[in-house]
Amino acid sequence: QKVTQAQSSVSMPVRKAVTLNCLYETSWWSYYIFWYKQLPSKEMIFLIRQGSDEQNAKSGRYSVNFKKAAKSVALTISALQLEDSAKYFCALGE
């Protein structure tokens, strides 16, 4: 299993939307991809979950564009605000 986030850093103005890309490799038949936000304190905050057999997930300002064939799961954060400045991680799990 492998997860790759190619964007090391992204800068966007407030109010706009940003898309964070994540590519993965897995041999699992059924799985979940999770997106987390890491605070400066290193605390990890769960944002959204995408199931491998589910439609694109959406939760408030967070939405996922899931392309199973391409093994891509992009997170879009809409209406950016200052407190969205953080590190974002995607993770793969069964």
Epitope: A17, G60, A79, Q81
Partner: antibody
């Protein structure tokens, strides 16, 4: 039904203060940027201020900076505009509006009239 | 600040006419341009967002086009309920600004 309802307008003397409120219903208020936009009698639209969904990001038009304060209470689904040191040129209908995720004002209230006159 | 120049400021037309309103901006907006309709005594109503996307519930006779600094709102066949004032608005940067409006009147 998605709705915004302003209140708090009225007649005030120059130099006076007024607090406008906007009650939101029918949507998850805490997910959206909100703005105040005003329209002087017979004139066009002028954006006044916006506040981010959590309240962490705020901007004002130069014409009201230092005099007006925008705030929100997500627990009460309410948006506010505290207006101090009011001037005659602040006379207008004040609208609250929701900004959608593509940066357009998709929901507007009916407006509340503020008249500044001695 | 981004200046918004709307033209014409007023326009007389007849039911069934095709009408075009233009909005020119002082700097490039990409596609961060919205159009609103306002009737007397009423709040504005969103018609077009992101330059060319039709807001849900808005009749398909309304369309928007353009990018950068030049944008247009077109009404393909005017209906009686379309006589109103139309505003463009940039959402690219603060302060958010509106055009001066175009008043569409019955000829």
């Amino acid at each position: 039904e998605v709705q915004l309802l302003e209140s708090g307008g009225g007649l005030v003397k120059p130099g006076g203060s007024l607090r406008l409120s906007c009650a939101a219903s029918g949507f998850t208020f805490s997910d959206y940027y909100m703005s105040w936009i005003r329209q002087a009698p017979g004139k066009g639209l002028e954006w006044v201020s916006y506040i981010s969904s959590s309240g962490s990001t705020i901007y004002y038009a130069d014409s009201v900076k230092g005099r007006f304060t925008i705030s929100r209470d997500n627990a009460k689904n309410s948006l506010y505009l505290q207006m101090n040191s009011l001037r005659a040129e602040d006379t207008a209908v004040y609208y609250c509006a929701r900004e959608n995720y593509l940066n357009a004002f998709d929901i507007w209230g009916r407006g509340t009239l503020v008249t500044v006159s001695s | 600040d981004i200046q918004m120049t709307q033209s014409p400021s007023s326009l007389s037309a007849s039911v069934g006419d095709r009408v075009t309103i233009t909005c020119r901006t002082s700097q490039s907006l990409s596609n961060y341009l919205n159009w609103y309709q306002q009737k007397p005594g009423k709040a504005p109503k969103l018609l077009i967002y992101a330059a060319s996307s039709l807001q849900s519930g808005v009749p398909s006779r309304f369309s928007g086009s353009g990018s950068g600094t030049d944008f247009t709102l077109t009404i393909s066949s005017l209906q009686p309920e379309d006589f109103a004032t139309y505003y463009c608005q940039q959402s690219y940067s603060t302060p958010l600004t509106f055009g001066g409006g175009t008043k569409l009147e019955i000829k």
